[in-house]
């Protein structure tokens, strides 16, 4: 079989949901000593980076200017060390947001509920869309989908304090083009069996895997690079829509 290098890891810097006309940054984490990185979009070559040898680093950042629906979709990357190419990375779904209109998010029976109550979110958008998405802040990879003509419902079932947090919804014009986000709705869940009034809410900072972790090479890193890279690929769980 043809020898290949371990596949790189592709990430979106800060978020995979990019407002239209803003710049997206994608990171391709490969291997120290890589002489070329390629970013592919929907199967076609999009951009090329050839890092300078004096600045050995285990990956590169690709910029995507002026985000729009033509640039939203599935990205992947590969890299080369000498003449040997890597396997292709997993696919990264890049979404453009702030398209067209803003939906309205509401929650029933209300934003303050007790543990065990059944809660349903409603997302409404009057313009032509049939798919709606509900996201919890700090959990942007856990997208819930629902369908409806102008309104979709998201039944949460009996809630616990784990459901506490801030929610937003989007209308989706296709898998990769979303509306403006709704105003956030903060769900407060109280009254678990044990006292949970001091239980922390979910973090609102970006998902940890939406951060580019590129490092400069040191002697030790050079020796461990391939082992480390293989281990990261093994443990990296990537979201697919």
């Amino acid at each position: 079989p043809k020898q290949t290098l371990p596949k790189p890891i592709i990430r979106a810097e800060s978020t995979y949901m990019v407002p239209k006309e803003k710049q997206a940054t994608l990171c391709c984490q490969g291997s120290y000593g890589a002489v070329e990185y390629q970013l592919h979009f929907e199967g076609s070559l999009f951009a090329v980076e050839r890092p300078k040898p004096p600045e050995r680093i285990n990956g590169v950042k690709f910029h995507i200017p002026d985000m729009n629906s033509r640039k939203a979709g599935r990205y992947s990357c590969i890299y080369r060390v000498g003449e040997l190419w890597s396997e292709r990375s997993d696919l990264l779904d890049l979404v453009v947001t702030e398209m067209y209109d803003t939906p309205t998010l509401s929650v029933h029976p209300g934003p303050e509920v007790t543990s065990g109550e059944k809660v349903t979110f409603y997302c409404r958008l009057d313009t032509a869309t049939s798919m709606f998405l509900l996201l919890k802040e700090g959990r942007s990879r856990d997208v819930q989908r629902s369908y409806g003509k102008v309104q979709a419902e998201f039944p949460m079932g009996p809630v616990t304090t784990a459901h506490r947090g801030s929610y937003r919804c989007f209308g989706s014009y296709n898998n990769y083009a979303w509306s403006f986000p709704s105003e956030p709705v903060k769900l407060l869940v109280t009254g678990d069996i044990e006292n949970t009034s001091l239980a922390p809410t979910d973090p609102t900072f970006p998902d940890s895997w939406d951060t580019c972790l590129l490092t400069r090479e040191t002697g030790l890193q050079k020796d461990l690079a391939l082992w480390d890279h293989t281990a990261q690929n093994h443990h990296h769980h990537h979201h697919h829509h």
């Epitope: 940054t25 979009f41 076609s44 070559l45 999009f46 951009a47 090329v48 980076e49 050839r50 890092p51 300078k52 590169v60 950042k61 690709f62 910029h63 995507i64 200017p65 002026d66 033509r70 640039k71």
Partner: nanobody
Framework: QVQLVESGGGLVQAGDSLRVSCAAS????????MGWFRQAPGKEREFVAA????????YYADSVKGRFTISRDNAKNTVYLQMNSLKPEDTAVYYC????????????????????WGQGTQVTVSS
């Protein structure tokens, strides 16, 4: 923002050489990666060649590799496309494009990567 103006196109015979130029306005030319694209009648715009901000990374379409050379003169705010051994299938409008990546060694291959475009210059190669 940057304005791009192409020049140097014309009518040549197959096998001849031609150099087209793209002059950029402004004093920050060295912060732009540059690309050349072409569009033949009835066809989609296609990538030809690209140069990184510092000129150390160049990339070519397979169809022009070994015949075309992209170069840039940051002091003159100009990028060039030297076209040798021209063929009739090279006939097209040639467009210059620019974008500002953070990296000095990155180039764009897809037209969507580029932010700014010139109006184009016609190159016709007769047999």
């Amino acid at each position: 923002q940057v304005q791009l103006v192409e020049s140097g196109g014309g009518l040549v015979q197959a096998g001849d050489s031609l150099r087209v130029s793209c002059a950029a306005s402004g004093r920050t030319f060295s912060t732009y990666a540059m690309g050349w694209f072409r569009q033949a009648p009835g066809k989609e715009r296609e990538f030809v060649a690209a140069s990184s901000r510092d000129g150390t990374t160049t990339y070519y379409a397979d169809s022009v590799k070994g015949r075309f050379t992209i170069s840039r003169d940051n002091a003159k705010n100009t990028v060039y496309l030297q076209m040798n051994s021209l063929k009739p299938e090279d006939t097209a409008v040639y467009y210059c494009a620019a974008s500002r990546p953070l990296s000095t060694t990155q180039v764009g291959i897809a037209s969507a990567w580029y932010e700014y475009w010139g109006q184009g210059t016609q190159v016709t190669v007769s047999s």
